[in-house]
C-alpha cells in the first residue's frame, strides 16, 4: 500500500525508483517519498505547512519502527518518551520524567526514589554495615606500655552505601577508655602495638561500653539506637565522672 492514500498528488514519477531520492521506491514532487525500498521505514517530516515523506534506515528520536506487510513505518512514542521499543515500553524518558516499568512518570511511586543521573525510579537502598571488628590493643600515644589508662578502638565496614532516601550509616568507629596493668616499657618496646598483651577487666566504676559522640551525630539522621545512646550519655555523665567516651565517624 502506498503511504499517500487520500493525499493529492501532483505527479508520480513514471519509473518507480528513477528520480526518487535516497531510499524512496515511489515518490511525487509534492509529497516526497510515497513508499520505501525494502527494510526502510517511512516517516513524515514537517516542512513549514506541509508534510514530506522520507525513507529512513532507522526511525528518529521519539519514534519506533513497525513492519507491516504493506509498509514499514515510524510510529510516535508516547508524548513523554524520548526513545521506545513500542507504545508500551519506553526506554528513555523526556526531560523531567522518570522511567519506571517502561513508563514515564513525573514522580516516582512510593518506596522508590528518582535517580537524577539515569532518570529512572530505583529502589531505596539503606546503609548496611558489617559486624564490629575486634577491639584494638589498649594504647596511649601509640604505646602499649608505660601507662595505666589508655584507649582502644574498633571499626566496622560499610557494606552498602545508602541512596539519597536511604537510612544513613551508623558510626563505623568506636573508641573507649581502657586500663592495663601498669608496666614499664622494656627497651625496644616503645610504640609497640602489643596485640598479644592481656587487658584487665574494667574496674567497677569504669564502663567499657562505647557511646557515640553526640556532636558527630548532630548533622545526621538519628537512628533509634543513637538517640538512646545520647540519652544514656547525659544520664551517665551525672552518675559517673569517669565515663568512657566514644569518638564516632558517621557516613
Amino acid at each position: 500500500q502506498n503511504a499517500s492514500r487520500g493525499r493529492r498528488q501532483r505527479r508520480m514519477h513514471p519509473n518507480v525508483s528513477q528520480g526518487c531520492q535516497g531510499g524512496c521506491a515511489t515518490c511525487s514532487d509534492y509529497n516526497g517519498c510515497l513508499s520505501c525500498k525494502p527494510r526502510l521505514f517511512f516517516a513524515l517530516e514537517r516542512i513549514g505547512m506541509k508534510q514530506i515523506g522520507v525513507c529512513l534506515s532507522s526511525c528518529p528520536s521519539g519514534y519506533y519502527g513497525t513492519r507491516y506487510p504493506d509498509i514499514n513505518k515510524c510510529t510516535k512514542c508516547k508524548a513523554d518518551c524520548d526513545t521506545c521499543f513500542n507504545k508500551n515500553f519506553c526506554t528513555k524518558c523526556k526531560s523531567g520524567f522518570y522511567l519506571h516499568l517502561g513508563k514515564c512518570l513525573d514522580n516516582c511511586p512510593e518506596g522508590l526514589e528518582a535517580n537524577n543521573h539515569t532518570m529512572e525510579c530505583v529502589s531505596i537502598v539503606h546503609c548496611e554495615v558489617s559486624e564490629w571488628n575486634p577491639w584494638s590493643p589498649c594504647t596511649k600515644k601509640g604505646k602499649t606500655c608505660g601507662f595505666k589508662r589508655g584507649t582502644e578502638t574498633r571499626v566496622r565496614e560499610i557494606i552498602q552505601h545508602p541512596s539519597a532516601k536511604g537510612n544513613l550509616c551508623p558510626p563505623t568507629n568506636e573508641t573507649r577508655k581502657c586500663t592495663v596493668q601498669r608496666k614499664k616499657c622494656q627497651k625496644g618496646e616503645r610504640g609497640k602495638k602489643g596485640r598479644e598483651r592481656k587487658r584487665k577487666k574494667p574496674n567497677k566504676g569504669e564502663s567499657k561500653e562505647a557511646i557515640p559522640d553526640s556532636k558527630s551525630l548532630e548533622s545526621s539522621k538519628e537512628i533509634p539506637e543513637q538517640r538512646e545512646n545520647k540519652q544514656q550519655q547525659k544520664k551517665r555523665k551525672v552518675q559517673d565522672k569517669q565515663k568512657s567516651v566514644s569518638v564516632s565517624t558517621v557516613h
Epitope: 513497525t66 507504545k87 508500551n88
Partner: antibody, heavy 116, light 107 residues
Framework: EVQLVESGGGLVQPGRSLKLSCAAS????????MAWVRQAPKKGLEWVAT????????YYRDSVKGRFTISRANAKSTLYLQMDSLRSEDTATYYC?????????WGQGVMVTVSS | DIQMTQSPASLSASLGETVTIECRAS??????LAWYQQKPGNSPQLLIY???SLIHGVPSRFSGSGSGTQFSLKINNLQSEDVASYFC?????????FGAGTKLELK
C-alpha cells in the same frame, strides 16, 4: 491495569460460523494495533490476524484469509473476530492481544472447538 | 513465511541448574526477536524483546543472545516457578511467526 477478556467461544460444526469478542480496559484501546493469536491443544502459538489502531488496515494469515474477519469498535473498546466456514484445524484457544511488534498484553483465551 | 525452529522440544533440569533454549530463523531477522513464557493453564507472557532486553519484573537470571538467524534464551539458577513452555517470535516480517515451543520441566 490492562485487561483483555475474550468471549464467544464454544463447540461448532465444520462449515458453521462463530464470532469472538474481546473487551479491553485499562489502556487507550484506540491507540493500539490489536491481534488474535491461537493455540491448538498442546501445540504452539499461531498469529491469526491484526487490525491497526484506527481499523483502516487488516492483515491475516493465509489459512484464514477470506474466512475470518477482524474488526474493532473503538468507542466500545472491543475487538472482534468473525469466523466463517470453520474447519476442524481451526480448533484452538483464541487469545486477543495488543500487537506492537511483540504481543505485550494477552487475554485469558477462549476455546473454539470445531467438530461434527 | 519465516520459519522459526526451536530446540529442544522439551527438557528436564534440576533446581539451580542453567538451561539454554535455542531458536533458529530461516532467514536473517536482525535483532527482531522476542521470547515468551507460558505457564501451565495461563496465557503467554512477554519476557524479552529485541533479542536481549528484559521486560521489567523479569528476573535477571533470564537472558537472551544472538543475532541474524541464531538466538538463545538462557535461564541461570533454575527455580520451580520457571517451569513453563517458552516460545520465540520474530517480528521482522509478516506474518509474525513463533517457534514450536520448548517445554521445561523439573527433574
Amino acid at each position: 491495569e490492562v485487561q483483555l477478556v475474550e468471549s464467544g467461544g464454544g463447540l461448532v460444526q465444520p462449515g458453521r460460523s462463530l464470532k469472538l469478542s474481546c473487551a479491553a480496559s485499562g489502556f487507550t484501546f484506540s491507540d493500539y494495533d490489536m491481534a488474535w493469536v491461537r493455540q491448538a491443544p498442546k501445540k504452539g502459538l499461531e498469529w491469526v490476524a491484526t487490525i491497526i489502531y484506527d481499523g483502516s488496515r487488516t492483515y491475516y494469515r493465509d489459512s484464514v484469509k477470506g474466512r475470518f474477519t477482524i474488526s474493532r469498535a473503538n468507542a466500545k473498546s472491543t475487538l472482534y473476530l468473525q469466523m466463517d466456514s470453520l474447519r476442524s484445524e481451526d480448533t484452538a484457544t483464541y487469545y486477543c492481544a495488543t500487537h506492537d511488534k511483540t504481543f505485550d498484553y494477552w487475554g485469558q483465551g477462549v476455546m473454539v472447538t470445531v467438530s461434527s | 513465511d519465516i520459519q522459526m525452529t526451536q530446540s529442544p522440544a522439551s527438557l528436564s533440569a534440576s533446581l539451580g541448574e542453567t538451561v539454554t533454549i535455542e531458536c533458529r530463523a530461516s532467514e536473517d531477522i536482525y535483532s527482531d526477536l522476542a521470547w515468551y513464557q507460558q505457564k501451565p493453564g495461563n496465557s503467554p507472557q512477554l519476557l524479552i524483546y529485541d533479542v536481549n532486553s528484559l521486560i521489567h519484573g523479569v528476573p535477571s537470571r533470564f537472558s537472551g543472545s544472538g543475532s541474524g538467524t541464531q538466538f538463545s534464551l538462557k535461564i541461570n539458577n533454575l527455580q520451580s516457578e520457571d517451569v513453563a513452555s517458552y516460545f520465540c517470535q520474530q517480528y521482522d516480517n509478516y506474518p509474525n511467526t513463533f517457534g514450536a515451543g520448548t517445554k521445561l520441566e523439573l527433574k
